[in-house]
């Protein structure tokens, strides 16, 4: 066959769907690879062809669109399963072509099983709610296009295994779940089950997401450097190991990049000739506030090193701060015999 622009296996779009539920999968060509949409392609005389490779097989085969009750069908650039079966798992390819043009991409589709409490190997999206922030809501995701607006589905929300009913601060409102107050106790997995009729059959869509309650932007502060501080002096003799921790607290801020770095005499450690190593550790509070510690280490410090300026810097979306460490050379204890001798005028 003639040459075809092959975008390969698009593993970035690992699609997971639940067994025995409807699934609509758009051909990724139009979403991520081509500069035109399906309508333009169709009106230009291009045809969209679907085929697949079963799990643990190498053979590409056409998709059977003649199954009972049209279990698998294609509509424009969408491949429909009504519903999926476990053995639909595999790599699916959509190819757009005519006599002079060809472009194709493959993507993995995994049909997963869930238990009665909605546990499954499905990768869950995370929705962050601000702690004690006021009314916030989550919306049942990825249900658009499954039924027309004239169809009124029933939606049931669950937290973990339990149906949300008289949950005090959590109120189901159709496709939305409203949190009157978001508390740490609201952390967990929330599932919406959308039930709708189609051609005399009833279908269910199950969507689970993880809610994580995080620090409120109203409480956010610039980075706070706990160490170094004015109370600790790093007093060393030449040849000893110098260890200076820089410990910084960062309030949680959505999409903020938290940075900590050291400068030695105003330069980054990489730009200086001394043998310095820096080790970083990060810990998080329950509301995702972050504490970063960078330990600056010089194995065998010289008297020159002890005269340098060591400054810890921190930056977040809330601001930038810096703090110098107090480093000094330890004054050796007087050697008694010599001092005594000097005292008597001996040479």
């Amino acid at each position: 066959s003639e040459r075809c622009d092959d975008w390969g296996l698009d593993t970035m779009r690992q699609i997971q769907v639940f067994e025995d539920e409807p699934a609509r999968i758009k051909c990724p060509l139009f979403e991520h690879f081509l500069k035109f949409n399906y309508s333009t392609a169709h009106s230009a005389g291009l045809t969209l062809i679907w085929y697949w490779t079963r799990q643990d097989r190498d053979l590409e085969e056409p998709i059977n669109f003649r199954l009972p009750e049209n279990r698998i069908s294609k509509e424009k650039d969408v491949l429909w399963f009504r519903p999926t079966l476990l053995n639909d798992t595999g790599n699916y390819t959509c190819m757009l072509r005519n006599t002079t043009y060809c472009s194709k991409v493959a993507f993995p589709l995994e049909v997963v099983q869930k238990d009665s409490c909605f546990n499954s190997p499905m990768k869950l999206p995370v929705h962050k709610l601000y702690i004690e922030y006021g009314i916030q809501r989550i919306t049942c995701p990825n249900v658009d296009g499954y039924f027309p607006s004239s169809v009124k589905p029933t939606i049931t929300w669950y937290m973990g295994c339990y149906k949300i009913q008289n949950f005090n601060n959590v109120i189901p409102e159709g496709m939305n779940l409203s949190f009157l107050i978001a508390l740490i106790s609201n952390n967990g997995n929330y599932t919406c089950v959308v039930t709708y009729p189609e051609n005399g059959r009833t279908f269910h869509l199950t969507r689970t997401l993880t809610v994580k309650v995080v620090g409120s932007p109203k409480n956010a502060v610039p980075p706070v450097i706990h160490s170094p501080n004015d109370h600790v002096v790093y007093e060393k003799e030449p040849g000893e190991e110098l260890l200076i921790p820089c410990t910084v607290y960062f309030s949680f801020l959505m999409d903020s990049r938290n940075e900590v770095w050291w400068t030695i005499d105003g330069k980054k450690p990489d730009d200086i000739t001394i043998d310095v190593t820096i080790n970083e550790s990060i810990s998080h509070s329950r509301t995702e506030d972050e504490t970063r510690t960078q330990i600056l280490s010089i194995k065998k410090v010289t008297s020159e090193d002890l005269k340098r300026s060591y400054v810890c810097h921190a930056r977040s979306a809330k601001g930038e701060v810096a703090k110098a460490a107090k480093v000094k050379q330890k004054v050796p204890a007087p050697r008694y015999t010599v001092e005594l001798a000097c005292g008597f005028g001996a040479t």
């Epitope: 601000y130 004690e132 922030y133 006021g134 009314i135 809501r137 919306t139 008289n166 005090n168 601060n169 109120i171 189901p172 409102e173 159709g174 939305n176 409203s178 009157l180 107050i181 409120s216 109203k218 409480n219």
Partner: antibody, heavy 119, light 110 residues
Framework: SLEESGGDLVKPGASLTLTCTAS?????????MCWVRQAPGKGLEWIAC????????TYYASWAKGRFTISKTSSTTVTLQMTSLTAADTATYFC?????????????WGPGTLVTVSS | AIEMTQTPSSVSAAVGGTVTINCQAS??????LAWYQQKPGQRPKLLIY???LLASGVPSRFKGNGSGTEYTLTISDLESADAATYYC????????????FGGGTEVVVK
Amino acid sequence: SLEESGGDLVKPGASLTLTCTASGFSFSSTYYMCWVRQAPGKGLEWIACIYAGSSGSTYYASWAKGRFTISKTSSTTVTLQMTSLTAADTATYFCARVDGSSSGSWDLWGPGTLVTVSS
Amino acid sequence: AIEMTQTPSSVSAAVGGTVTINCQASQNIYSNLAWYQQKPGQRPKLLIYAASLLASGVPSRFKGNGSGTEYTLTISDLESADAATYYCQGAVYSGNTEWAFGGGTEVVVK
């Protein structure tokens, strides 16, 4: 309990600030504080609510936006600032507490304060 | 904005009787509905919240029901102390958060 104050007889076009003071409890992240009014012989009308937590998120009836401002001034007081008052604003103004940990129930109301707008 | 329509505007019944008050929301309010009792010159008193939950200290003669856009308050075994105006109140938290009250129903006990 809740107690409203600041109600007065004012002229059209004037401004007025009402205060709601809580006693026996202090505003916490569990509560929303709201203002509702009732014109003489008429029904209840929601004006605005404020979240008592640190964010102080505010919620207004569409007709109240711009002319009414709800604020939390301390851990036990909420105010309602009203501007460009007209005779239609003559009413008893109630302060109410909404319990966010109890399905949003409006469980505590003040006795109300009367605002009269007349020339 | 949500609108709450309450019917009837007035209802009369004998002591020991039953009255039913209806409240219709202009959109689905998902059981975010409360009922209040107000006597002349007094503050409103919460009776029912979340459509059917009885507020603390309220006798079980008061019963709330309904879902979606249609809700009812039923008062059985009427007592003379039940003479008051009753208001429904709906809330919507998703989208633009708002609350709205019905126009009120006057209950006269004969």
